[in-house]
């Protein structure tokens, strides 16, 4: 039985030509995690596996950093960046966990962080 | 410019244990993980598992898990892929493969070491 | 474990000839994809990784495409040079996979 959750930084918004941290947290489960993909729709930005680092996407490759921790941080943001962003935790022995960014950029300078949510 | 080059042929009995060696150069080695690839007489490529060799951090296939075991020597620039519990059908050409900078594609290959497993 | 399904596993064609091999992956690998060619008594050499991207000194008759579970591998005008045979990997997730493997031969 799956008894994680995984937090994340939830609805986040950003300005065009800045940067943002995209985070998530499995809690609840003793699960070892393997691995974590970080995908944006139908595309894969990032592969962070436990034991063997990082894969970085070639078309991400110049504007996706690694880190903080099994998080990424997305560069140089476009309101293109604008959209839905998962977190899938591999575990073992659970299986998977997803959690879901949103994040908006914004023409503007007004842009504040969103509160964190919880998905089951 | 980058080479592995991996240990002699090995002819073991079934049982026993074998180790092969794979030694790079012409990069820093602790930059990217080493895989273990295997391929038996007329079959596909078969992911043995990985090791990190900046920490250690190893992957092995479940189906390997317990029975292979992937060491570094970072001194020598060198990764260590042991196989115990030998049987007939470990019989393969072993690779040692480096992953690209940041990428999880195989690079850079070994010449591939012959392990026959025969009584 | 990811199961990647390659075919034809084996194919003859002509000198000039446009060739397609086709990989299947068993679930969403997204573009996490690499083909390789094998001669034969030698390693695999590195031709096409995350899906559509040309290796360092690859010759621009090697191209692939696709995404999620379907890929396409492609020699526009066969050499002779390119008998071999060719294999696909996925490393969406491990276990690491690769497809059984299409072998080249020329007509």
């Known amino acids: 039985m799956m008894t994680g959750t995984i937090e994340t930084t939830g609805n986040i918004s950003a300005e065009k030509g800045g940067s943002i941290i995209l985070q998530c947290h499995l809690s609840s489960t003793t699960a070892q995690v393997t691995q974590v993909n970080w995908e944006q729709q139908d595309q894969l930005l990032a592969i962070c596996n436990a034991d063997l680092g990082w894969h970085i996407s070639p078309s991400f490759k110049d504007r996706v950093a690694p880190g903080p921790g099994l998080g990424l941080t997305l560069q140089s943001l476009t309101v293109n960046d604008t959209g839905e962003y998962f977190c899938i935790y591999h575990t073992y022995p659970d299986g998977t966990y997803t959690g879901r960014i949103f994040l908006e950029v914004l023409e503007s300078s007004v842009a504040e962080h969103g509160a964190r949510f919880q998905i089951p | 410019q980058v080479q592995l080059v991996q240990s002699g042929a090995e002819v073991k009995k079934p049982g026993a244990s074998v180790k092969v060696s794979c030694k790079a150069s012409?990069?820093?080695?602790?930059?990217?993980?080493m895989h273990w690839v295997r391929q038996a007489p007329g079959q596909r490529l078969e992911w043995i598992g990985g090791i990190n060799p900046n920490q250690g951090g190893t992957s092995y296939s479940q189906k390997f898990q317990g029975r292979a075991t992937l060491t570094v020597d970072t001194s020598a620039s060198t990764a260590y892929m042991e196989l115990s519990s030998l049987r007939s059908e470990d019989t393969a050409v072993y690779y040692c493969t480096r992953s690209s900078y940041y990428r999880y594609d195989l690079d850079y290959w070994g010449q591939g070491t012959t392990v026959t497993v025969s009584s | 474990d990811i199961q990647m399904t390659q075919s034809p596993s084996s194919l003859s064609a002509s000198v000039g000839d446009r060739v397609t091999i086709t990989c299947q992956a068993s679930?969403?690998?997204?573009?996490?994809l690499a083909w390789y060619q094998q001669k034969p008594g030698k390693a695999p050499k590195l031709l096409i990784y995350s899906a559509s991207y040309r290796y360092t000194g690859v010759p621009s008759r090697f191209s692939g495409s696709g995404s999620g579970t379907d890929f396409t591998f492609t020699i526009s005008s066969l050499q002779p040079e390119d008998i071999a045979t060719y294999y696909c990997?996925?490393?969406?997730?491990?276990?690491?996979?690769f497809g059984g493997g299409t072998k080249l031969e020329i007509k």
């Open positions: 990997h996925q490393h969406y997730t491990t276990p690491w996979t």
């Open positions: 679930q969403d690998i997204k573009t996490a």
């Open positions: 012409g990069y820093t080695f602790t930059e990217n993980a």
